[in-house]
Amino acid sequence: IPLTESYCGPCPKNWICYKNNCYQFFNESKNWYESQASCMSQNASLLKVYSKEDQDLLKLVKSYHWMGLVHIPTNGSWQWEDGSILSPNLLTIIEMQKGDCALYASSFKGYIENCSIPNTYICMQRTV
Amino acid sequence: IPLTESYCGPCPKNWICYKNNCYQFFNESKNWYESQASCMSQNASLLKVYSKEDQDLLKLVKSYHWMGLVHIPTNGSWQWEDGSILSPNLLTIIEMQKGDCALYASSFKGYIENCSIPNTYICMQRTV
């Protein structure tokens, strides 16, 4: 293959591969907890946004989908499933509803929502 | 790697790989002819929509972007850059403007536009 071309992955079959991360958009609506469980069952996690550059494909995502960001009421911070804190200036967080979970919306927006509301979701698997 | 996982590609560096097709969304606005030239310079073509199943990632694309579909006034058909005719029921063609070129819009819509209008564009490379 040409030097300018490369393989991406490995990823679960029929997932999107971009800059060696794997993504899948799930069409069925689940609450945040069910969405998290679905991703975990596929050795993945809900979407984690860590870089506007490495994840610029997310700019053009239509609609809004559960991601792995949750509000920790005790200290008021937003953190990812892996326990890391949301970096400043990565997401524009907008309170659409009183809640402790967040939907990913295009152009790096995070919509605060009630965790029990059903929504579509994005799973992500980082390749090693 | 697990049997359920696989590599995707090969694709140009930092392109999106999905079901062994390569896609890139270009942010700068160009007219249809300039967009075509830009894709060709990268050994690719403007987006060709050939399968709702193999290209279901296109459902979730926000906004609208030049694709490789042009109107042939002599016979009234729509055809791709490679000369193949648009398959029926693949795209909902909507006349936004008098024109002979088409923009891809989410959920498999094609917006007819004047070819000289600048828009963002999608390049595609099919892997062998």
């Epitope: 609609s63 809004y64 967080i93 907008i94 659409m96 509803q97 929502e113 509301i117 | 926000k62 959920s107």
Partner: antibody, heavy 115, light 108 residues
Amino acid sequence: QVHLQESGPGLVKPSETLSLTCTVSDDSISSYYWSWIRQPPGKGLEWIGHISYSGSANYNPSLKSRVTISVDTSKNQFSLKLSSVTAADTAVYYCANWDDAFNIWGQGTMVTVSS
Amino acid sequence: EIVLTQSPGTLSLSPGERATLSCRASQSVSSSYLAWYQQKPGQAPRLLIYGASSRATGIPDRFSGSGSGTDFTLTISRLEPEDFAVYYCQQYGSSPWTFGQGTKVEIK
């Protein structure tokens, strides 16, 4: 491009319920949050509330006890109900989508509350 | 709720002049969650600026937004005849979302 069209009665009697519907021109009902905003004659704009395609609604506390916003994804429509109306509810009512802000608006429908 | 106060109430200017519109919030608007809209008589408002400074699609570059915290500004660098209208600011940093009372830009 998304187009929005409000519909409903232009005249409502005091103490009755105002009902409006907003029809979305394409299949984008599941792509955005959908809002209602009103503007009394010669005055400014007031956000009433919004709803997601899954039915999660948020209302302006000043109207919360009287307002219900619902969505019907199968018809590409969302609706506003405002109960126990008075003359103070006379306004142009707009529907709008929320993306980066209120990006796309309907043309508005004038509702007069009068007996 | 956050109260937005716009000034001046009316701005009388000639085409080609620069217009500066102010929007002051009663408390800090988090992360510059402020939008500007233009409304002409008998029409719906049109989004001009979001995120305090980002121009909406199709908005000419003579429109610019700036500011943070409690003080925001919409600037029209050279007024065109079609720019004479009422302008509203709106915050979406905290619920309920609120609008300013508007500034009318009229022909002098």
